[in-house]
């Protein structure tokens, strides 16, 4: 499966939208920094078959969609930017789902690495727990926004490696 060039562009647009979403100066939020334990090894892409890598990327984007679709998120971010954000995430999910369907029967290995999917879910559970503990404060959301931008940048590296693997 070829991940379309539009997918990379959508990823870049997603990062640009997230960069615009800030509502307060992050400089006031230094003390709220937190170690969410980003599962770097799941995005290194070395130990994966292609289909498994795609499923991990899909899970990350799905979890991001879920995180920013909550009532608390809607109350925090600009509605217009959120709508653009959802559109880009939806586009990426569709691209990855189409790719996963094409990979069916291509590889002998399972389409999904369950352990990796669970690792990504636990990462997002830690983010949600942090937001809850911080009572969804503006600074907590700023820290989460920075973390998601970083994770998207790192996942973009995996996507590029997948593109080069064709």
């Amino acid at each position: 499966c070829d991940l379309p060039q539009t997918h990379s562009l959508s990823n870049r647009r997603t990062l640009m939208i997230m960069a615009q979403m800030g509502r307060i100066s992050p400089f006031s939020c230094l003390k709220d920094r937190h170690d969410f334990g980003f599962p770097q090894e799941e995005f290194d892409g070395n130990q994966f078959q292609k289909a498994q890598a795609i499923s991990v990327l899909h899970e990350m984007i799905q979890q991001t969609f879920n995180l920013f679709s909550t009532k608390d998120s809607s109350a925090t971010w600009d509605e217009t930017l959120l709508d653009k954000f959802y559109t880009e995430l939806y586009q990426q999910l569709n691209d990855l789902e189409a790719c996963m369907m094409q990979e069916v029967g291509v590889e002998d290995t399972p389409l999904m690495n369950v352990d990796s999917i669970l690792t990504v879910r636990k990462y997002f559970q830690r983010i949600t727990l942090y937001l809850t503990e911080k009572k969804y404060s503006p600074c907590a959301w700023e820290v989460v926004r920075a973390e998601i931008m970083r994770s998207f940048s790192l996942s973009a590296n995996l996507q590029e490696r997948l593109r080069r693997k064709e």
């Epitope: 960069a19 230094l30 170690d35 700023e142 973390e147």
Partner: antibody
């Protein structure tokens, strides 16, 4: 390879203006903040201020607020430190360093080589 | 502003010695503390971040500990290249502040 390359040494007279630069390469320039640190001859390190190159938001140490201006041009991955009117007491080595912002990552993990500014009549 | 106080301001030691430098913050900073090494004419170099995490590429003889207000940088076995000035820096809040430095000299 991550690098921060600063502009060369400067010799200026009191009252003159100056703008020194710090060019980042080998990483996404807008994903990190750039901080500036002063070191006067034979003295310790003093944090001056910081900029987020993605939107040019700045924060200054109260000691340097109004004394210097920090700016950035993300199109050329460069941050700047400038003075409108130098004083002899501005004589120092100035370093830029990158900061991970709100991410849980090492602070000031890469530094420029330093720019020596000498102000003398 | 958060004040950072290092001790001692200088010390003399021999190669192979165990060296300990302390840093005290004027208020609790959790584990938001970094340690840097600076050699004459060179830019500072990050050694330890978040109080105890060893920066990539830094020898394991360097270690950091502490949290709250009291922190320690330890060099388990001093090497010739370790003679330098060491600075702590609080990373909790702006303005970021450094300790005054500890110069490690050859005995």
């Amino acid at each position: 390879e991550v690098q921060l390359v600063q502009s060369g040494a400067e010799v200026k007279k009191p009252g003159e203006s100056l703008k020194i630069s710090c060019k980042g390469s080998g990483y996404s320039f807008t994903s990190y903040w750039i901080g500036w640190v002063r070191q006067m001859p034979g003295k310790g390190l003093e944090w001056m201020g910081i900029i987020d190159p993605s939107d040019s938001d700045t924060a200054y140490s109260p000691s340097f607020q109004g004394q210097v201006t920090i700016s950035a041009d993300k199109s050329i991955s460069t941050a700047y430190l400038q003075w409108s009117s130098l004083k002899a007491s501005d004589t120092a080595m100035y370093y830029c360093a990158r900061h991970p912002g709100l991410n849980w990552a090492p602070d000031f993990d890469y530094w420029g080589q330093g720019t020596l500014v000498t102000v003398s009549s | 502003d958060i004040q950072m106080t290092q001790s001692p301001s200088s010390l003399s030691a021999s190669v192979g010695d165990r060296v300990t430098i302390t840093c005290r913050a004027s208020q609790s900073i959790g584990d938001f503390l970094n340690w840097y090494q600076q050699k004459p004419g060179k830019a500072p170099k990050l050694l330890i971040y978040f109080a105890s995490s060893l920066q990539s590429g830094v020898p394991s003889r360097f270690s950091g500990s502490g949290s709250g207000t009291d922190f320690t940088l330890t060099i388990s076995s001093l090497q010739p290249e370790d003679f330098a000035t060491y600075y702590c820096q609080q990373a909790l809040d702006f303005p970021l502040t450094f300790g005054q430095g500890t110069k490690v000299e050859i005995k």
